[in-house]
């Protein structure tokens, strides 16, 4: 008789999840010499231990502490790029500007990027059928808690000038429900962070509006001003040209506004 299984609203664990995590860990530690000491089997065991046999709506940041410890990594605190609803461009940027880092350029972010996972209470099985959806089921699910934990730590580590890339095509350019709006912005440390610089990425080719005047951007400035962090904002009118100019800064067309 098949055992009754909880049916969640979200997609199930990504297929070949254990193999993917392990393979990503090996690849990352090979490419990044400073992380060569990491034992990827131990990393997988800690990752698994955070959610296996636990109710997928009762996961806590504490569950991920062993993994956080193993994945401890020092990135230059003044070279951090946060992003919200514009992951692909942020990643394209750090692939070119190699001295800047998104969360997904760190080991833990790289391991989990675009993956879904959850287990079941009291069984060692991984649930490949369905996992809790943040809105429809519960917020304390394995994936959401993981990203909340690593995002908080990443923001807490930032210093000097922190950059954030925001999607100017969205109705809420700064969204309080995004990871940036709900976690990262509140965990920047005023004693370390001098300025938050927002890059608002325009979508339309003919869009010449100053999106730095958008009410949600003003809201972002208001929030961080109370924490004594300075704020600056730049419109990136031509993201394609922006990337091109990061690759070839000496190009004559790169002196004009992008």
């Amino acid at each position: 008789v098949p055992r009754w299984r909880q049916q969640w609203s979200g997609p199930g664990t990504t297929k070949r999840f254990p193999e993917t995590v392990l393979a990503r860990c090996v690849k990352y530690t090979e490419i990044h010499p400073e992380m060569r000491h990491v034992d990827c089997q131990s990393v997988w065991d800690a990752f698994k231990g955070a959610f296996i046999s636990k109710h997928p709506c009762n996961i806590t940041e504490e569950d991920y502490q062993p993994l956080m410890k193993l994945g401890t990594q020092t990135v230059p605190c003044n070279k951090i790029l946060l992003w919200s609803r514009i992951k692909d461009l942020a990643h394209q940027f750090t692939q070119v500007q190699r001295d800047m880092f998104t969360l997904e350029d760190t080991l833990l972010g790289y391991l989990a990027d675009d993956l879904t996972w959850c287990g079941e209470f009291n069984t060692s099985k991984i649930n490949y059928q369905s996992c809790p959806d943040w809105r429809k089921d519960c917020s304390n699910n394995p994936v959401s808690v993981f990203w909340k934990t690593v995002s908080r730590r990443f923001a807490e580590a930032a210093c000097d000038v922190v950059h954030v890339m925001l999607n100017g095509s969205r109705s809420k350019i700064f969204d309080k429900n995004s990871t940036f709006g709900s976690v990262e912005v509140h965990n920047l440390q005023p004693e370390k962070v001098q300025t938050l610089e927002a890059w608002v990425i325009h979508g339309g080719r003919e869009d010449s509006r100053d999106l730095c005047q958008d009410p949600t951007i003003k809201e972002l400035e208001s929030i961080i001003s109370k924490r004594n962090i300075q704020f600056s904002c730049k419109n990136i009118y031509r993201p394609d040209k922006f990337l091109q100019c990061v690759k070839n800064p000496e190009d004559s067309s790169c002196t004009s506004e992008i």
């Epitope: 004693e191 009410p215 949600t216 809201e219 400035e221 208001s222 001003s225 109370k226 924490r227 004594n228």
Partner: antibody
Framework: EVQLLESGGGLVQPGGSLRLSCVAS????????MNWVRQAPGKGLEWVSS????????YYADSVKGRFTISRDNSKNTLYLQMNDLRAEDTAVYYC???????????WGQGTTVTVSS | QSVLTQPPSASGTPGQRVTISCSGS????????VNWYQQLPGTAPKLLIY??QRPSGVPDRFSGSKSGTSASLAISGLQSEDEADYYC???????????FGGGTKLTVL
């Protein structure tokens, strides 16, 4: 002239309700977070609630949580405070004040008096 | 009981320098925006100092400073019109709230 003008105060019995309004003029209301601050007779200032520019972030003092509701109508340049289940300890002059980034509450209204008594 | 602690009263003679202290914690004064407000008798409060700076129109006799979890307001060349209540305020990260000191009544003798 930059101005905030409160109204809606009055005498109300314990358990009753009142709705305060605050009309802004002389500045771009939609660029500012707004606050309600109160002052009981002979006492100090007590922050009551704040609402962000778009209304996405709303905060309340513990003493009014669940009873008071802050809101704003940007098209009318108006801030509101709906006060329910009023208690004697809510008796105070209620001020609205804007929050200017990096500055503080730099424009205050003249205040409206709320008296809760049977 | 206020989150920020101020002395209830202070006094000085005309021309003197008076300092009012405000004590808080790392979740408010230490890292965040600190303001001082002046409330003259029977009037609404007025922003006097923000982040140790003066809004336009505030005389340079008023100055603010901050060290760790404490802030202070200094008034030099005290004048009779400075007789008022003075409040410190700061945003508190852990409470997600503006917190005020209990106020200091300044008397010019």
């Amino acid at each position: 002239e930059v101005q905030l003008l409160e109204s809606g105060g009055g005498l109300v019995q314990p358990g009753g309700s009142l709705r305060l309004s605050c009309v802004a003029s002389g500045f771009t209301f939609t660029n500012y977070e707004m606050n309600w601050v109160r002052q009981a007779p002979g006492k100090g200032l007590e922050w009551v609630s704040s609402i962000s520019i778009t209304g996405n972030y709303i905060y309340y003092a513990d003493s009014v949580k669940g009873r008071f509701t802050i809101s704003r109508d940007n098209s009318k340049n108006t801030l509101y405070l709906q006060m329910n289940d009023l208690r004697a300890e809510d008796t105070a002059v209620y001020y609205c004040a804007n929050y200017k980034s990096y500055h503080g509450m730099d424009v205050w209204g003249q205040g409206t008096t709320v008296t809760v008594s049977s | 009981q206020s989150v920020l602690t101020q002395p209830p009263s202070a006094s000085g003679t005309p021309g003197q320098r008076v300092t009012i202290s405000c004590s808080g914690s790392s979740s408010n004064i230490k890292n965040n925006l600190v303001n001082w407000y002046q409330q003259l008798p029977g009037t609404a409060p007025k922003l006097l100092i923000y982040n140790n700076q003066r809004p336009s129109g505030v005389p340079d006799r008023f100055s603010g400073s901050k060290s760790g979890t404490s802030a202070s307001l200094a008034i030099s060349g005290l004048q009779s019109e400075d007789e008022a209540d003075y409040y410190c305020a700061a945003w508190d990260d852990s409470l997600n709230a503006w917190v005020f000191g209990g106020g200091t009544k300044l008397t010019v003798l």
